[in-house]
Interface confidence: medium
């Protein structure tokens, strides 16, 4: 069956300066390919985190994505700023040249509250 990308929260609210976790789990690791987090949709979407060797300031993975059986691709955003507000999507790709997007989570909207 087709892999599902599950983002159970529709929205989260976080005070500026605090941290928040955006939850994402997959029902399968197949087909082989990367998982990436984006803010927004379409051509203007911004890459927030990729579960590779790249370094993303203030964004970390919650569980060990290198473990073979891991299906949890949640991320933690630290020291949240008002500019972090928006809708975040967890996206599964199939490896190729280039990688092909095959499934997206439903999105989680981040609201940033004034401290």
């Amino acid at each position: 069956t087709e892999v599902k990308v599950i983002q159970p929260e529709k929205s989260v609210s976080v005070a500026a300066g605090d941290s928040t976790v955006l939850n994402c789990t997959l029902t399968s690791l197949l087909p082989v390919g990367p998982i990436r987090w984006y803010r927004g949709v379409g051509q203007s979407r911004q890459l927030i985190y990729s579960f590779t060797t790249e370094h993303f300031p203030r964004v970390t993975n919650v569980s060990d994505a290198t473990k073979r059986s891991n299906l949890d691709f949640s991320i933690r955003i630290s020291n949240v700023t008002p500019e972090d507000a928006g809708t975040y999507y967890c996206v599964k790709f199939q490896r190729g040249s280039p990688d092909t997007e095959i499934q997206s989570g439903g999105g989680t909207e981040v609201y940033v509250l004034a401290k």
Partner: antibody, heavy 119, light 108 residues
Framework: DVQLVESGGGVVRPGESLRLSCAAS????????MNWVRQAPGEGLEWVSL????????YYADSVKGRFTISRDNSKNTLYLQMNSLRAEDTAVYYC????????????WGLGTLVTVSS | ETVLTQSPGILSLSPGERATLTCRAS??????LAWYQEKPGQAPRLLIY???SRAAGIPDRFSGSGSGTEFTLTISSLQSEDFAVYYC??????????FGGGTKVEIK
């Protein structure tokens, strides 16, 4: 106080159409995702359809896909369910349900409206 | 699609007794599970969300527990107004949102 009042139910023949309405009050309707859930006589609850606050995103149960259309008019605080090609198995009480703002559970329900499909 | 199975189908108890209702999921839904109460002629009422959090205005004789695939709704001491049908619903998996088949709590 949150209030959801369904209307539009009735008796129709197989193949006919019906439009249900749900008048909402007591909360910010335009930002709330809304659902229709039904209950056939003597049966359990069955989720039918979901529409996002803006109306841009809709989902349907496989059993009604292609026959039912969910819509909303945020200026009138009203949710609709257009039901076409009705079948006997669509006979049920149809509930309008408001989703929680953060998760997809239902924090408020209407009393329901009965739809009977019979020849 | 996540299938929810409720047991027992019917629970016959006397007022003052403890009711234990079970909901099992075909796959893990973590703690993304809600319980509702339904009475004839009334709107269904949210009792529990997040597997164990009571909704506003729900008496503390109602409690929920569990995570993953096994969940329990407990009514510590049944009152006359508690005799009704109870449904669980998972909201972890994106639509279709699924309900259990229900448990009827009836007077013995």
């Amino acid at each position: 106080d949150v209030q959801l009042v369904e209307s539009g139910g009735g008796v129709v023949r197989p193949g006919e159409s019906l439009r249900l309405s749900c008048a909402a009050s007591g909360f910010t309707f335009s930002t709330s995702d809304m659902n229709w859930v039904r209950q056939a006589p003597g049966e359990g609850l069955e989720w039918v359809s979901l529409i996002s606050g803006s109306g841009e995103i809709t989902y349907y149960a496989d059993s009604v896909k292609g026959r039912f259309t969910i819509s909303r008019d945020n200026s009138k605080n009203t949710l609709y369910l257009q039901m076409n090609s009705l079948r006997a198995e669509d006979t049920a009480v149809y509930y309008c349900a408001k989703e929680n703002d953060r998760y997809r559970f239902f924090d408020y329900w209407g009393l329901g409206t009965l739809v009977t499909v019979s020849s | 699609e996540t299938v929810l199975t409720q047991s027992p189908g019917i629970l016959s108890l006397s007022p003052g007794e403890r009711a234990t209702l079970t909901c099992r999921a075909s796959q893990s839904v973590y703690t993304y599970l809600a319980w509702y109460q339904e009475k004839p002629g009334q709107a269904p009422r949210l009792l529990i969300y997040g597997a164990s959090s009571r909704a506003a205005g729900i008496p503390d004789r109602f409690s929920g527990s569990g995570s993953g695939t096994e969940f329990t709704l407990t009514i510590s001491s049944l009152q006359s107004e508690d005799f009704a049908v109870y449904y669980c619903q998972q909201y972890y998996d994106r639509p279709p949102l699924t309900f259990g088949g229900g448990t009827k709590v009836e007077i013995k």
